[in-house]
Interface confidence: medium
């Protein structure tokens, strides 16, 4: 064997560590943890790069990583690992996390480009819940890969501190 397993290290990656179980589920196997952005392929018997299979139809093994990768490719979006969702910065500007700072600050400089609700927000019509550090604290959270909105998803300040710390 050559060229395999050299980068393997202890500790579980944030990327889902999944392996086949006889029941057909993909379950975590701590003893076979792989570096971040890799997964354990039981048939190949080694850690594999998730990037290699993100374009493949069936990437159950790397679903989280691939969603994150695809999300990062889209301007004005970021992947939230706690929510496991692709978040649209446009929907949360004014109460945005640091991941949206570049997008939102550029948008806010040109109010003509803003959607009406954000123009209202900018002129103080909507309560601004961000503190001085710019952390998103308490309004409705919108945006996902499949659709631009996740209506009704409300997060507490504690949850959001977790997400964006």
């Amino acid at each position: 064997m050559s060229g395999l397993g050299r980068s393997r290290r202890g500790g579980r990656s944030r990327v889902d560590q999944e392996e086949r179980s006889p029941q057909g589920l993909w379950t975590g196997v701590a003893m076979r943890s792989c570096p971040e952005e890799q997964y354990w392929d039981p048939l190949l018997g080694t850690c594999m790069s998730c990037k290699a299979i993100c374009n493949h139809q069936s990437q159950r093994t790397c679903a989280t990583f691939c969603r994150s990768l695809n999300c990062r490719k889209e301007q004005g979006r970021f992947y939230d690992h706690l929510l496991r969702d692709c978040i649209s910065c446009a929907s949360i500007c004014g109460q945005h996390p640091k991941q949206c700072a570049y997008f939102c600050e550029n948008k806010l400089r040109s109010p003509v480009n803003l959607p009406p609700e954000l123009r209202r927000q900018r002129s103080g019509e909507v309560e601004n819940n961000s503190d001085n550090s710019g952390r998103y604290q308490g309004s409705e959270h919108r945006g996902s890969e499949a659709s631009p909105a996740l209506p009704g998803l409300k997060l507490s300040a504690d949850q959001l501190a977790l997400v964006y710390s």
């Epitope: 060229g3 086949r20 057909g24 048939l43 018997g45 290699a52 069936s58």
Partner: antibody, heavy 118, light 107 residues
């Protein structure tokens, strides 16, 4: 469409080496693992080894360890399997097969017959 | 390594017949069982992955069932082009292993 085209039949003497090629087309070569499988006359299909798509990492069956070398040329979208120290029992049809990431091999080459005879 | 045992090793049937081939794994492999078709001088073809999922372009007369250690491939109505050798393969764990094959011949 996906195609794997292998090199032609070979006749070799015992102790010699053989190198079989597998040219891929119809997909992004570096996105899939390429495996090699052989079938001796009257025998079952036998897995030999594979090469990873994004680096030159390889893994071989214990049975062939030390005698088999799988390589690739990304620019030519071609994988190679070299088997050394040939013996008569290596007479077989050698196949390259693309791994579909789900535990199966979704496309195969047409096979290359290697005959080892003195 | 997981051992795969196919039966029967050969089978004679006629066009229009319903045919069943079985494959047994030496240990539980869930549903990670694939079937292939091989004709002389032709490339091996994937028929079915994950026990019962037809590969693209495979006719619906082919079906698969089973789980754990016992699996079957069924051809509901044999066509002339179905006379070939069929292999099962476990995709559950390294290294991949194949059954001994079932040769389907014209009666």
């Amino acid at each position: 469409q996906v195609q794997l085209v292998q090199s032609g039949a070979e006749v070799k003497k015992p102790g010699a080496s053989v190198k079989v090629s597998c040219k891929a087309s119809g997909y992004t070569f570096t996105n899939y693992v390429m495996h090699w499988v052989r079938q001796a006359p009257g025998q079952r299909l036998e897995w030999m080894g594979y090469i990873l798509p994004y680096n030159d990492g390889t893994k071989y069956s214990q049975k062939f360890q030390g005698r088999v070398t799988i390589t690739r040329d990304t620019s030519a979208s071609t994988a190679y399997m070299e088997l050394s120290s040939l013996r008569s029992e290596d007479t077989a049809v050698y196949y390259c097969a693309r791994y579909d990431w789900e535990g199966s091999f979704d496309y195969w080459g047409q096979g290359t017959t290697v005959t080892v005879s003195s | 390594d997981i051992q795969m045992t196919q039966s029967p090793s050969s089978l004679s049937a006629s066009v229009g017949d319903r045919v069943t081939i079985t494959c047994r794994a030496s240990q539980d492999i869930g549903n990670y069982l694939n079937w292939y078709q091989q004709k002389p001088g032709k490339a091996v073809k994937l028929l079915m992955r994950y026990t019962s999922r037809l590969h693209s372009g495979v006719p619906s007369r082919f079906s698969g069932s089973g789980s754990g250690t016992d699996f079957t491939l069924t051809i509901s109505s044999l066509q002339p082009e179905d006379f070939a050798t069929y292999y099962c393969q476990q995709g559950f764990t390294f290294p991949p292993t194949f059954g001994g094959g079932t040769k389907l011949e014209i009666k």
